[in-house]
């Protein structure tokens, strides 16, 4: 589910026509072009496994395939966080792990992957068709989420292989961080190419390679994902979602998430992947953790008359670094 942009293949000029200076001038544009072409988006993979020993026990494993430092991970079920999903756990690399029943044991497996054991019975018991989602907030990529569920026919003890399920959602800082550098590089590249064009230099020859040649993964949403904005939220059957959780659905307002399960009925072996459109930026990157709690499937329960919404509790040290990571 990546948006891809075609990049025309450029041929270097024939040697000897511009001399050493020309070669040196063109090294930087080629490096920048390579960066522009190969720069990819991070990915999140989700693996859901039902334990053979206990049919009501699930293990969810999630990982982040990106170069940034992870500042928060949120695991939810019943759909993406903030779109009807209910938070099961929040894992902060500096502050610890906050989890809600029926989550039993959330933990970091590596610097970029986590696992969560779910146990339950009755109303708070997950079942095979429950969708589990993992959202990784990282710097500078922003916030990325993917979802998965057990294939309906899978045997206990088996699991779908971890499948990368990227989502085209990046918070402002992620876009400005990585994309900003790339955008600057690409603009500079075009500037150099334009300068180069205005000289009596040799022309760029028509491509002799396949038109499918290098492809750049773009940050902008594709037409398909833009169309997703107009698609009503489609939830995989989650009849086993809990009725007794302390966390409930997010409060009012339209959801910015529009999800499109990418797996078809005839292809049930992989976890569900969810596409989404970039959501409006919330002002600053530090607000990602606020957002996670503000949409984390909370109820505003039994609140007194004066309850108002504030930025989420992170303590006074929260601003010392991205999401309190110092």
């Amino acid at each position: 589910m990546r948006t891809e942009a075609q990049v025309p293949a450029l041929q270097p000029p024939e040697p000897g026509l511009e001399g050493a200076m020309g070669h040196r001038t063109l090294v930087l544009p080629w490096v920048l072009l390579t960066l522009c072409v190969t720069a990819g988006t991070p990915e999140v993979w989700v693996q859901v496994r039902m334990e053979a020993t206990e049919l009501s026990s699930f293990t969810i494993r999630c990982g982040f395939l990106g170069s940034g430092s992870i500042s928060l991970v949120t695991v939810s079920w019943g759909g993406p966080n903030g779109a009807g999903g209910t938070t099961l756990a929040v894992l902060h690399p500096e502050r610890g792990i906050r989890q809600w029943a029926p989550a039993r044991q959330a933990r970091w497996e590596t610097q970029s992957s986590i696992s969560l054991i779910l146990e339950g019975s009755g109303a708070s018991s997950p079942c095979a068709n429950t969708t589990f989602c993992c959202k990784f907030a990282s710097f500078p990529e922003g916030s990325w989420e993917a979802c998965g569920s057990l294939p309906p026919s899978s045997d206990p003890g088996l699991s779908a292989p971890p499948t990368p399920a990227p989502i085209l959602r990046a918070d402002l800082a992620g876009i400005l961080g990585v994309s900003g550098v790339l955008l600057f590089g690409c603009v500079y590249l075009l500037h150099l190419l334009r300068r180069h064009k205005h000289r009596p230099a040799p022309r760029l020859q028509p491509s002799r390679t396949s038109p499918q040649a290098p492809r750049a993964r773009a940050w902008a949403p594709s037409q398909a994902s833009q169309a997703a904005l107009h698609v009503p939220y489609a939830t995989i059957n989650t009849s086993c979602r809990p009725a007794t959780l302390d966390t409930a659905h997010p409060h009012g307002g339209p959801s910015w998430w529009a999800s499109l399960p990418t797996h078809a009925a005839h292809r049930p072996q992989g976890p569900a992947a969810w596409a989404s459109t970039p959501i409006p930026a919330r002002g600053s990157f530090v607000s990602v953790e606020n957002g996670l709690y503000a949409q984390a499937g909370e109820r505003p329960p039994h609140t007194g008359p004066g309850l108002t919404l504030f930025p989420d509790p992170r303590g006074p040290r929260a601003m010392e670094g991205p999401l309190g990571v110092r």
Epitope: I97, Q99, R107, T247, Y293, L309, P311, P316, G324
Partner: antibody, heavy 120, light 113 residues
Amino acid sequence: QVQLVQSGAEVKKPGASVKVSCKASGYSFPSYWMHWVRQAPGQGLEWIGEINPSNGLTNYNEQFRNRVTMTVDTSTSTVYMELSSLRSEDTAVYYCARHHGSTYYALDSWGQGTLVTVSS
Amino acid sequence: DIVMTQSPDSLAVSLGERATINCKSSQSLLNSINQKNFLAWYQQKPGQPPKLLVYFASTRESGVPDRFSGSGSGTDFTLTISSLQAEDVAVYFCQQHYSTPPTFGGGTKLEIK
């Protein structure tokens, strides 16, 4: 300075409910989760649950899940903990405590405690 | 839930001497991400609420005298009072602050010999 002031001692009959309050001052109230911890006479400490004052999000210890309700009134910077279906083993000192700014579950400021006695 | 076990239950130490209290957790409290151990120590004097002394196993809370020090990693932790003072008589609790629900040790009563 940070102050957490709790309501006074309570004597309740088995089966009744008790509601303890904790008024916070001296810091940004919405910025810290508030926790409730109890201590039976001569015993250790037991975590009951926590509440996010900024949005009312709660998280309860499984052992108390069906009997406890935590609420917040931001206009008075007060959190409440209500425990229902009281039994004699609920006799304890109940503390509210604020979480430490750099970790979710270390508790750096505590109320003075509220003794709840359950007796027939 | 993570089970915290303290030893000894009670301890008598002479004034000016070193006091050592141990705490063991049923699973590792070491966070692989930042290599911090999520273990806290509290002091509770009679009729008072607990007071945070140390968190992250060895980080002293502001205002806590430097005779109090925490050490250990993984599942085994120690609180050391280098030179016992009369005002240190109290019950000391360890607590894991790594994940929900936070759990406490049973406490160690420290007295003067």
